[in-house]
Interface confidence: medium
């Protein structure tokens, strides 16, 4: 009776920076009673960890038994459907889940205007599950690169884009008025991590005076 | 001296593409910003984007909307406009210009920012 339930069809992780969440897609027509086995394997140590014996929902987030994500050779996981005393085969992640799977996020964007200067500042994520010592900087101690994307409404342009190479950056507003709406991608040179575009913060320009909203 | 001269336009039916490019006969312009503007029959000129001398920031007009690239290549002094999912309302000459300085600056939204001229070419689309 232990292979009657269909496999969930997929299992991938989406992690962004100490935010590992493992996702998967539902077995058809499941019921009521239906809910989903986790297990995780560390590369090195070849052996499979139950996470999560019946998890009802198709996410677990497996930041706190990940957290050595960034100084390992990765991790493998595997889920499987169970109903009662039936279950499922396991479905297992199609790639290693190691630091190259991590999206690249920002904390925030800070703006300030300075003598015709837009003026950024990049704060780099700082998530509650990391531990002390494992700063953004210091595991991506090097090339650190990001994209500014800038809009300004209403405007005779729709964005600049710059790559910079360090946490602030400055525009020259050149006499130019109106608001100015800022996006950040961060992206590390030596690496092949995905990035994701920043929320939106904008800040005010005015001949007078300036204000700054989000 | 800085002498630009574009070429690549023609006819082009909506939702093609062209590719233009601006080749730069005298100094080098590696230097300097350089960009596209362009000019609608009966219309003023009009910034279309424009790209930093190490290619790190771009800029483009708010109709581009994701359609066009901008991209030079200093080794060749040739400065390239893609322009994709081209519609009526593109046809217009296209002139690539070059002006001095490296300042991340709005300035460069501005045909008075840039000293050196090409003399254009037609983009007509047209079905």
């Known amino acids: 009776h232990g292979t009657e339930l269909p496999s969930p069809p997929s299992v991938w992780f989406e992690a962004e920076f100490f935010h590992h969440i493992l996702h998967w897609t539902p077995i058809p027509n499941q019921s009521e009673s239906t809910c989903y086995e986790v297990a995780l394997l560390r590369y090195g140590i070849e052996s499979w960890n139950s996470i999560s014996n019946c998890s009802q929902t198709l996410s677990y987030d497996l930041t706190a038994v990940t957290l050595d994500l960034y100084h390992s050779n990765g991790y493998r996981a595997r889920v499987r459907a169970v109903d009662g005393s039936r279950h499922s085969n396991w479905t297992v992640t199609n790639t290693r889940f190691s630091v190259d799977e991590v999206t690249l996020t920002v904390g925030s964007v800070n703006l300030e205007i300075h003598n015709g200067f837009i003026l950024g500042k990049i704060q780099l994520p700082r998530p509650k599950m990391a531990p002390a010592n494992d700063t953004y900087e210091s595991i991506f101690s090097h090339f650190r690169e990001y994209e500014i994307a800038i809009r300004k409404v209403p405007g005779n342009f729709t964005f600049t884009h710059k790559k910079v190479k360090h946490e602030n950056f400055s525009l020259l507003t050149s006499g130019e008025v109106g608001e100015f709406c800022v996006q950040v991608k961060p992206s590390v040179a030596s690496r092949s991590n995905k990035g994701m575009w920043s929320k939106e913060e904008c800040i005010s320009l005015t001949r007078q005076y300036f204000t700054v909203t989000n | 001296e800085v002498q630009l001269l574009e070429s690549g336009g023609g006819l082009v039916q909506p939702g093609g593409s062209l590719r233009l490019s601006c080749a730069n006969s005298?100094?080098?312009?590696?230097?300097?910003?350089v960009g596209w503007f362009r000019q609608a029959p009966g219309k003023g000129r009009e910034f279309v984007s424009a790209i930093t001398w190490n290619g790190d920031t771009t800029y483009f007009g708010d109709f581009v909307e994701g359609r066009f690239t901008i991209s030079r290549d200093n080794s060749k002094n040739t400065l390239y406009l893609q322009m994709n999912s081209l519609r009526a309302e593109d046809t217009a000459v296209y002139y690539c210009?070059?002006?001095?300085?490296?300042?991340?600056?709005?300035?460069?939204?501005?045909?008075?920012?840039?000293?050196?001229w090409g003399q254009g070419t037609l983009v007509t689309v047209s079905s």
């Open positions: 005298g100094r080098t312009f590696s230097s300097h910003t």
């Open positions: 210009a070059a002006a001095t300085g490296q300042v991340w600056s709005l300035q460069y939204l501005r045909e008075s920012s840039y000293a050196y």
